[in-house]
């Protein structure tokens, strides 16, 4: 099943390499112009 993990900072993840992009939850995408 799909998960919504991976929204925290890489530095807080316990494994040596989580493989996850930062994916910050407060980021917003500019509308395409």
């Amino acid at each position: 099943s799909e998960t919504t993990t991976g929204t925290s900072s890489n530095s807080s993840q316990s494994t040596s390499n989580s493989g996850l992009a930062p994916n910050p939850t407060n980021a917003t995408t500019k509308a395409a112009g």
Partner: antibody, heavy 117, light 113 residues
């Protein structure tokens, strides 16, 4: 030495389900990292399909989400991509690649899938 | 989704030339928590898988020659090849590794003049 290798059918018919396998050597798939599936239509750019993390959690591209399942077989160190309702626009080379926290550092050789009746 | 725009789409150059490829993102790729830009460059040769060149906008991958360099921050990035070698003729892609879904630029095909 880390290697990834994709395998699966070269030809599928429209509306059929595609199943591809990515076999990993050189590290245990439960030890870290993600593995993503990425595709490239002929002569076009790369498109990220989705990933499965070392924990087994998944994330999919919203544009394909309803058609996708990515799973794993830890005993075989393999990942499986299943894509339903294939269409000719899904004709592409499909890659699996290991994801770090910054990039895809190792890629499979790719497997070409043609969707045609 | 974050849009990644590369320019030019194709480029003719000669061995020994200095070449610059530009990549622009529709949103900043600078992560405030670690002050890193999550922008990656790959090289792809015909019939082959992409090869990692540069991550975090400017960090060369292991084994990548020093003639390849990446720079930029926020939304504007460049890949520079200081002196083209015959093996550098290929297609180059930028990618944002910041927010899902991960997205790639349209590619820049570097051809021999």
């Amino acid at each position: 030495q880390v290697t990834l290798k994709e395998s699966g059918p070269a030809l599928v018919k429209p509306t059929q389900t595609l199943t591809l396998t990515c076999t990993v050597t050189g590290y245990s798939i439960t030890s870290g990292y993600t593995v993503s599936w990425i595709r490239q239509p002929p002569g076009k750019a790369l498109e990220w399909i989705g990933y499965i993390q070392y924990t087994g959690s998944t994330r999919y591209n919203p544009s394909l989400k309803t058609r996708l399942t990515i799973s794993r077989d830890t005993s075989k160190n393999q990942f499986v991509l299943t894509m339903t309702n294939m269409d000719p626009v899904d004709t592409a080379t499909y890659y699996c690649a290991r994801g770090t926290t910054a990039s895809f550092d190792y890629w499979g050789q790719g497997t070409t899938v043609t969707v045609s009746s | 989704d974050i849009q990644m725009t590369q320019s030019p789409s194709s480029l003719s150059a000669s061995v020994g030339d200095r070449v610059t490829i530009t990549c622009r993102s529709s949103q900043s790729l600078l992560y405030s928590s670690d002050q890193k830009n999550y922008l990656t460059w790959y090289q792809q040769k015909p019939g082959k898988a992409p090869k990692l060149l540069i991550s975090w906008a400017s960090t060369r991958a292991s084994g990548v020659p020093s003639r390849f360099s990446g720079s930029g921050s926020g939304t504007d990035f460049t890949l520079t090849i200081s002196s083209l070698q015959p093996e550098d003729f290929a297609t180059y892609y930028c990618q944002q590794y910041f927010i899902y879904p991960l997205t790639f630029g349209g590619g820049t095909k570097l051809e021999i003049k």
